[in-house]
Amino acid sequence: MMTGTIETTGNISAKKGGSVILQCHLSSTMAQVTQVNWEQHDHSLLAIRNAELGWHIYPAFKDRVAPGPGLGLTLQSLTMNDTGEYFCTYHTYPDGTYRGRIFLEVLESSVAEHSARFQIP
């Protein structure tokens, strides 16, 4: 029975050339989180955080993606092409797969603010 829910930073915006933190938080379940996948809108994997193996950043993103904080992901040196959907996928036992969605808008404007609904320590 999948009882959990995923909270995400929702819709966020950040400045071109800057960085942004993508975060998800799984709650309302006692399930073990065995792995968290971070994916881009076109289904390409950015990074995986495995409970035993730790972080694996995919080669195409090695220069611009930093693991953390926590199970989150930091995108750096943002370009306009980074605008779009990002998904966190929590693989858990005994529940299964939970998925959260974040929409990132990268703005040219220097007044763009990075707004997040919540912070996870």
Partner: antibody
Framework: EVQLVESGGGLVKPGGSLKLSCAAS????????MSWVRQSPEKRLEWVAE????????YYPDTVTGRFTISRDNAKNTLYLEMSSLRSEDTAMYYC????????????WGQGTSVTVSS | DVQITQSPSYLAASPGETITINCRAS??????LAWYQEKPGKTNKLLIY???TLQSGIPSRFSGSGSGTDFTLTISSLEPEDFAMYYC?????????FGGGTKLEIK
């Protein structure tokens, strides 16, 4: 080339035990979660066990919980399935399979080893 | 457990034709369905995962679609080597469960 070779199957009496092995090659075994899946004589597939890359996490369906134990030896690149209190309904072809690194499905399978439980 | 109903269980077609195989889940499994091909003397092959993502090395004539409870595998312009057994599997929640299979034969 990824290869998974199962062994250890055979004929066993109800209530008996058997230990299956799966020798892996062609990839970094310790980086992948692994599963056992069986196929009944009626050709139905059933997932029976899964183990995480380091062996810390093991998962089973209710049908085999308490009777089957999955384990691995990463130094030997080998996956195991220890089966006890075997029943006639455990008769099947048993396959080991590698899970994708992203955990989304099983991307490589072995040829299988046959287990028959009969008196 | 999530029950997966696969249809049809048997399908006859000719090379060059386009066919579809369906899988229906007893409850929503989001996009998490995989498709496998089984051929005698060969190891099972992953074709599609996460509903529509083509596994590396699989020809583009194979495609998957669907989400929630209803999913479809389409094979366009059938090749002789495509005649085989096909299974779907949900990878959304434990225990992982499979459809009953579809046998695709040459007409």
């Amino acid at each position: 080339e990824v290869q998974l070779v199962e062994s250890g199957g055979g004929l066993v009496k109800p209530g008996g035990s058997l230990k299956l092995s799966c020798a892996a090659s062609g990839f970094t075994f310790s980086s992948y979660a692994m599963s056992w899946v069986r196929q009944s004589p009626e050709k139905r597939l059933e997932w029976v066990a899964e183990i995480s890359s380091g062996g810390s996490y093991t998962y089973y369906p209710d049908t085999v919980t308490g009777r089957f134990t999955i384990s691995r030896d990463n130094a030997k690149n080998t996956l195991y399935l220890e089966m006890s209190s075997l029943r006639s309904e455990d008769t099947a072809m048993y396959y080991c399979a590698r899970k994708r690194r992203d955990y989304y499905a099983m991307d490589y399978w072995g040829q299988g080893t046959s287990v028959t439980v009969s008196s | 457990d999530v029950q997966i109903t696969q249809s049809p269980s048997y399908l006859a077609a000719s090379p060059g034709e386009t066919i579809t195989i369906n899988c229906r889940a007893s409850k929503s499994i989001s996009k998490y369905l995989a498709w496998y091909q089984e051929k005698p003397g060969k190891t099972n092959k992953l074709l599609i995962y996460s509903g529509s993502t083509l596994q590396s090395g699989i020809p583009s004539r194979f495609s998957g679609s669907g989400s929630g409870t209803d999913f479809t595998l389409t094979i366009s312009s059938l090749e002789p080597e495509d005649f085989a057994m096909y299974y779907c599997q949900q990878h959304n929640e434990y225990p992982w469960t499979f459809g009953g299979g579809t046998k695709l034969e040459i007409k």
